[in-house]
């Protein structure tokens, strides 16, 4: 069941230079049909079968994880980096993403989120919490997961196009999805809309322009008239169960 999925290492990665040109910049085709070129994948892990998951940045890890070298607290130190369990209250940290949901990094210590701690423009950093298109959710609020008091109580919900950290930051009918260098609120997909079918578990995503998941009662499936097409060009749309 969905509830047994305890850790989601969401492999939404950046386009590597060979595909995307210098520095991972997409071609102009992304502007025309965002997301169509890039298929992503998710890695689901249960606590009784936990495998270290390689990563380049926090965004590729689950909501209760951050990206770092196993022997060091901060990412980017060199060597292989993997998704590590987030740090609980009063543990040392270097950035918000290292702290578990509901906490943020203040003066090197994970502290409980309290809106009064944040000056204007300050942010509680996290990662995308989209488990993918095969799990359907109530529009706008994703899947069973921890949410923070900060997200739920202290600030207004973001409209489409606003910066977000998680889907609970966004208004009803929207989810928080990757948008090039940032994450913004985007519409949950409706019936008939093109969706991204995440392939096998553990495959690395290449979405720099991420779509939301399909809305309630919908699943991301191959469009019927595209069955004959080659695997690489199959079009997926949100369809009724």
């Amino acid at each position: 069941t969905l509830n047994s999925v305890l850790i989601n290492s969401n492999a939404i990665k950046n386009l590597p230079p060979p595909l995307g040109g210098a520095g991972g910049q997409p071609g102009s085709a992304v502007s025309v049909a965002p997301g169509v070129l890039y298929e992503g994948g998710n890695k689901y892990q249960t606590l009784d079968n936990y495998q270290p998951y390689p990563c380049a940045e926090d965004e590729e890890c689950g909501s209760d994880e951050y990206c770092s070298s196993p022997s060091r607290g901060a990412a980017g130190v060199g060597g292989v980096q993997i998704c590590l369990a987030c740090r609980k209250r009063r543990k040392r940290c270097m950035r918000h993403a290292m702290c578990c949901p509901g906490n943020y990094c203040k003066n090197g210590i994970c502290m409980p989120s309290d809106h009064s701690h944040f000056p204007r423009g300050e942010i509680e950093e996290s990662i995308i919490e989209n488990l993918g298109n095969d799990h359907n959710a109530a529009a706008g609020d994703g899947y069973p997961r921890r949410t923070t008091l900060t997200s739920k109580i202290y600030h207004t919900k973001g409209q489409e196009g606003s910066v977000c950290l998680r889907s609970s930051d966004c208004a009803a009918g929207l989810c928080c999805a990757r948008h090039f260098w940032s994450k913004i609120c985007k519409p949950v997909l409706k019936e008939g809309q093109v969706c991204t079918k995440h392939k096998r578990k553990g495959s690395h995503g290449l979405e720099i322009f991420q779509r939301c998941y399909c809305g309630e009662g919908l699943a991301c499936r191959i469009q019927k008239d595209h069955h004959q097409a080659s695997n690489s060009s199959r079009l997926h749309t949100c369809q009724r169960h």
Epitope: S31, E122, H155, E160, G161, S182
Partner: antibody
């Protein structure tokens, strides 16, 4: 108080190099996407480059690709723009910009906060 | 690239006037558009995000509307401090692109 202060501008000859810095304060630097935007004298704004919050993804305008490199040092709260093979058309004020936050009221947007800029003049 | 065409390029108006600036995208950009104000020698200031969201500290005489390809920035009653250049920015596609600017001058 969010503050972005650019430095490193100056006069350089065509073909030369320059490294711009943007020192940030008043916020947790490592949590934000950052950008360089330039403005030639008397002209409009032109996006130059962006970098994701942890620095893994970088993006460049076609006009600077292969010549400019954006980077960040989260331990120093500083954003950089290494500019090589400079041309006369690179002459501009270079601004550092930062995205907003979901905790802004209302929730923030991209390119929300800007520094005051540093002038780069490429001339022989 | 997505082209942003701003009009007019300049306008003369008096204090108290209602001023409208438009921005047209070469393709649909949903509501992924910001409006900025820039005064001479100063950095741009974000006025409106996502086409219509007034930013904190920005006077309510500024408003934004539109979606898709056509967008409008309206100043309901022009004040002396509003004389400046205004830019739109689309962030729907890469690269992000600005309009060429609209200079609002005193009549």
């Amino acid at each position: 108080q969010v503050q972005l202060v650019e430095s490193g501008g100056g006069l350089v000859q065509p073909g030369g190099s320059l490294r711009l810095s943007c020192a940030a304060s008043g916020f947790t630097f490592s949590n934000y996407g950052l950008h360089w935007v330039r403005q030639a004298p008397g002209k409009g704004l032109e996006w130059v480059s962006s970098i994701s919050y942890y620095g893994s993804s970088t993006y460049y305008a076609d006009s600077v690709k292969g010549r400019f490199t954006i980077s960040r040092d989260n331990s120093k709260n500083t954003l950089y723009l290494q500019m090589n093979s400079l041309r006369a058309e690179d002459t501009a004020v270079y601004y550092c910009a930062r995205d907003g936050s979901h905790m802004d009221k209302p929730p923030g947007y991209v390119f929300a906060f800007w520094g005051q800029g540093t002038l780069v003049t490429v001339s022989s | 690239d997505i082209q942003m065409t701003q009009s007019p390029s300049s306008l003369s108006a008096s204090v108290g006037d209602r001023v409208t600036i438009t921005c047209r995208a070469s393709q649909g950009i949903k509501n992924y558009l910001n409006w900025y104000q820039q005064k001479p020698g100063k950095a741009p200031k974000l006025l409106i995000g996502a086409a219509s969201s007034l930013q904190s500290g920005v006077p309510s005489r500024f408003s934004g509307s539109g979606s898709g390809t056509d967008f409008t920035l309206t100043i309901s009653s022009l004040q002396p401090e509003d004389f400046a250049t205004y830019y739109c920015l689309q962030y729907y596609g890469m690269p992000p692109t600005f309009g060429q600017g609209t200079k609002v001058e005193i009549k």
